[in-house]
């Protein structure tokens, strides 16, 4: 529990401290205060670097001091023989003695008190971006007119976020443009267009003047465009360094303008408009697109018709064409559908004949029916040769899809009759 | 068959055996058997066999049995109360529609039908083959197939032969242009039990083939001349009957 003051005494003080002791005290004062630790008595066996016996003062990971030997006050009006001032609210004191003492040493007496720290001046890092106000136990930051204190209660910025642009065309500029933009600000602008339209940003080089990058090439003030998982920028410098036309491929764009404490320039101005989302002209083999256009955009519908001998297999039914729509995400609907060669399937069996297994049953393949010779012959002509046609049927040049008919050969005995002589 | 020789079914793969009455027929395609009307008039559900030279019961068990679906007797065939006394064998032709198609092979295949052109008009002396399991010189019924080659003869030769066991006076027997007379050479002739079998003649337009010029019908006396139904005169009826009673599978 934090306290405002306290006393720390070595073991048995004011009697001699025992050998082989290690004792520590954790000092904590309330937040916003520092600690003033002072010793009024110090009588500890002296050794080089206080290696034998010592009292150690530690602040976080830093050793503030290590004491041994005898001390007396330099000031006749003050009993303090040694003191420490830390700007933190926690401190640890550790007393150690080794296994032997040459003489009788009485140890130490120390006191601590909570002291106010001036956060505005006591630290290398200034806690406030603009105005710092110290009070006992803490500090607060404040801002000049037209600035507001950010949620971190330290930084001031202008109120330049929260605008959402939904119109299909518009203009956005940095605060005060073309006057210098405010320092130490983060401005976020959101463009949210109807799905199916991509945000296209256009900038003129001369409409951009933002504090230049440091020697390592890092922008000190920056303009960034974020569209989904794509980022454009950060951009900075005199004259816009990026593409003058940014096609975001997204209907949502976040514009983030981040400034630091120094180097304000005139800023930037941009225009944006919504373009219907383009869909790429995909390479769909063995097919024709109707209508044929150089560029397809959101809501465009094409009929994709398979070339003769090809079909689109959807489920298990073959069709010769399908429709595809350019969707709001820039992708075509039905993109999984493809024109593939028509499969005429296993040829039908015929009675009293056969068909050899074709190498393939796809479009253009050829099969041949034969009759079981010499007992059957092909009655309806056509030669028995069929090819896999574009409509998925096995077709003969003469019979079309009609199957050959194997009919019995008549009047032919397997062996001629020979009369036996009597 | 009188005066004939032993034959193998491979010589006459169209030969059909009827067991009741004991008779013959000719296979003309997968579904149809051609026979004489008098063979089937008394039994409209005949049992038939194909593919066997021998009609021994044990051999028939291994041959192909044909099941009839329907019998079509020529409308010109006169049905009698007492068939035994028949003297008119005009239009002695019938078709048997089979329930299932016959599978063709070396021992089973059809005989052709005659064409309608004059090429298929028979001349006296034209040779034809007859086959069957009917009466021989030695026995009432043959167990193994017999066959003979005999010539076409003028109809008067058949008229001149005295009927062996007449059931009526000689003048009562009817002779028409629907009949072919054949035989009279070396005593070769068809006989009782051969009825319905084909009188097979070499096709004038394709010497490798035989067609059914006639069907064994009747005769005055075995071993002389025999009368055969002239199939050419019935080709239209045969085609029409088959067409009207076929399944799409045959069409």
């Amino acid at each position: 529990e934090p306290t405002m003051y306290g006393e720390i005494l070595s073991p048995n003080y004011p009697q001699a401290y025992p050998s082989e002791v290690e004792k520590s005290w954790d000092i904590e004062v309330p937040e916003g205060y520092g600690i003033h630790l002072y010793f009024t008595h110090l009588d500890i066996e002296l050794s080089e670097n206080c290696a034998y016996d010592s009292v150690q003062i530690i602040s976080g990971d830093t050793e503030e001091g290590r004491l041994c030997g005898q001390r007396s006050s330099n000031n006749p009006h003050s009993p303090i023989v040694e003191e420490f001032q830390v700007p933190y609210n926690k401190l640890q004191v550790i007393f150690k003695s080794d296994f032997s003492n040459e003489e009788r040493f009485t140890g130490f007496a120390a006191y601590y008190v909570a002291t106010d720290i001036n956060e505005c001046t006591d630290f290398v890092d200034v806690p406030c971006s603009h105005f710092c106000n110290n009070f006992i136990g803490g500090y607060f930051c404040s801002c000049p007119p037209e600035y507001f204190l950010h949620d971190d209660m330290k930084n001031c910025g202008v109120n330049c976020s929260g605008d959402v642009f939904t119109a299909l065309i518009g203009e956005i500029a940095s605060p005060n443009y073309p006057k210098p933009y405010p320092e130490n600000s983060r401005c976020e602008y959101q463009i949210r267009l109807e799905k199916g339209f991509q945000v296209v940003v256009t900038l003129r080089r001369e409409d951009f003047d933002v504090e230049a990058a440091d020697s390592a090439g890092n922008c000190l003030d920056s303009l960034v465009f974020v569209a989904g998982d794509r980022q454009f920028g950060p951009y900075c410098g005199h004259g816009f360094p990026g593409p003058l036309n940014i096609e975001t491929k997204s209907n949502a764009l976040d514009i983030i303008f981040q400034t630091d404490l120094t180097g304000q320039k005139k800023g930037w101005k941009l225009r944006y408009h919504g373009d219907p989302m383009p869909c790429p002209k995909e390479d769909t083999p063995n097919s024709v697109w109707e209508p044929a256009k150089a560029k397809y955009v959101f809501r465009d519908v094409v009929q994709i018709t398979c070339l003769d001998g090809f079909e689109v297999v959807e489920g298990r039914v073959g069709a010769t064409s399908f429709y595809s729509t350019c969707q709001s995400n820039g992708k075509w609907s039905n993109s999984k559908l493809k024109c593939q060669p028509v499969d005429c399937g296993i040829p039908e069996s015929i009675e009293n004949g056969k068909v050899e297994d074709p190498e393939s049953t796809l479009f253009g393949s050829v099969i041949r029916y034969t009759c079981e010779e010499p007992y059957y012959y092909m009655e309806n002509g056509g030669g028995g040769e069929y090819h896999c046609a574009g409509n998925g049927s096995w077709v003969n040049e003469v019979l079309g899809p009609e199957l050959p008919k194997c009919v019995p050969v008549c009047g032919v005995p397997r062996e001629p009759f020979e009369e036996k002589q009597r | 068959i009188i005066g004939g020789s032993d034959a193998d079914i491979k010589n006459f793969p169209w030969q059909v055996f009827f067991d009741n009455p004991w008779a013959g027929g000719a296979l003309i395609n997968e579904y149809w058997v051609l026979t004489a009307a008098h063979v089937v008039e008394g039994n409209r559900e005949p049992t038939m066999y194909v593919g066997s030279t021998s009609v021994q019961t044990s051999r028939l068990a291994k041959s192909k049995m044909l099941t009839p679906e329907h019998v079509f007797i020529h409308p010109g065939w006169k049905l009698l109360e007492v068939p035994e006394g028949r003297t008119n064998f005009d239009n002695d032709i019938a078709l048997v529609r089979l329930k299932d198609p016959v599978k063709m092979g070396p021992t089973v295949s059809p005989i052709c039908l005659p064409g309608t052109s004059s090429d298929y008009n028979l001349m006296d002396g034209d040779l034809g083959l007859i086959s069957g399991w009917g009466r021989t010189e030695k026995r009432d019924r043959a167990v193994r197939l017999k066959a003979a080659r005999l010539p076409v003869a003028p109809l008067r030769k058949c008229k001149e032969v005295k009927v062996e066991k007449p059931t009526a006076d000689a003048e009562a027997y009817v002779f028409t242009p629907n009949m072919i007379c054949a035989g009279g050479e070396k005593g070769m002739d068809s006989c009782k039990g051969d009825s319905g079998g084909a009188f097979a003649v070499q096709d004038p337009n394709d010497k490798t083939k035989f067609y059914a010029a006639g069907l064994v019908s009747w005769g005055p006396q075995c071993g002389t001349y025999g009368l055969y139904t002239r199939v050419k005169n019935y080709v239209d009826w045969i085609m029409k009957t088959m067409q009207e009673n076929s399944t799409p599978r045959e069409d």
Epitope: V317, G318, G345, P347, E351, V355 | R249
Partner: antibody, heavy 118, light 109 residues
């Protein structure tokens, strides 16, 4: 007379395998495409697989693809169905059938019962 | 895939009555590739009508089949005791699968 006789069915655990055979006679086996069709107890008919007359083209029901293999040995007039990774839902009476004109199944075997159960 | 729906699922009629069994396809089917089978309990199915209207071997002439496109019918003009069975329609499209209807059970009333 056309005859198809299936064999090889039996009881098998899920994940197990079976090989069904179908012996054909009475027709020229190598001239016909053949199919396997199954019927779960008390249910309707379900086509399983088809093989072309020479055996080089095969087609399967989606749910058996990759698990079942249809094959044939034309020298032995026999059709096969190798069934791997069997599931409870494969339990059925399996018929082999001959494919005729129009892909009608004009002759069927008597069926062989496959039961998949733990 | 093409789905075949048979109706009714069960048909109860008396001998001598006329029976009409329906088979509806989810998309058009070639009449050459639409077939009917008869199955009796404990027996394998038998091809009954092939290519919409052709009677298989041995099927009595009281049976007939008709239809085109998506609607097909099997008709029995006058029911005989041996006709009571389950009837399945079946279609083939060149891209498998073959599909069967769920069956119509024709039972004696």
């Amino acid at each position: 007379e056309v005859m198809l006789v299936e064999s090889g069915g039996g009881l098998v655990k899920p994940g197990g395998s079976l090989r069904l055979s179908c012996a054909a006679s009475g027709f020229t086996f190598s001239n016909y495409a053949m199919s396997w069709v199954r019927q779960a107890p008390g249910k309707g008919l379900e086509w399983v697989a088809t093989i072309s007359s020479g055996g080089s083209h095969t087609y399967y029901l989606d749910s058996v693809k990759g698990r079942f293999t249809i094959s044939r040995d034309n020298s032995k007039d026999t059709l096969y169905l190798q069934m791997n990774s069997l599931r409870a839902e494969d339990t059925a009476l399996y018929y082999c059938a001959r494919l005729f004109t129009g892909y009608a199944m004009d002759y069927w075997g008597q069926g062989t019962l496959v039961t998949v159960s733990s | 895939q093409i789905v075949l729906t048979q109706s009714p699922a069960t048909l109860s009629l008396s001998p001598g009555e006329r029976a009409t069994l329906s088979c509806t396809a989810s998309s058009s089917v070639s009449s050459s590739y639409l077939h009917w089978y008869q199955q009796k309990p404990g027996k394998a199915p038998k091809l009954w009508i092939y290519s919409t209207s052709n009677l298989a071997s041995g099927v009595p002439s009281r049976f007939s089949g008709s239809g085109s496109g998506t609607d097909y019918t099997l008709t029995i003009s006058s029911l005989q005791p041996e006709d009571f069975a389950t009837y399945y329609c079946h279609q083939y499209y060149r891209l498998p699968p073959h599909t069967f209807g769920q069956g119509t059970k024709l039972e004696i009333k």
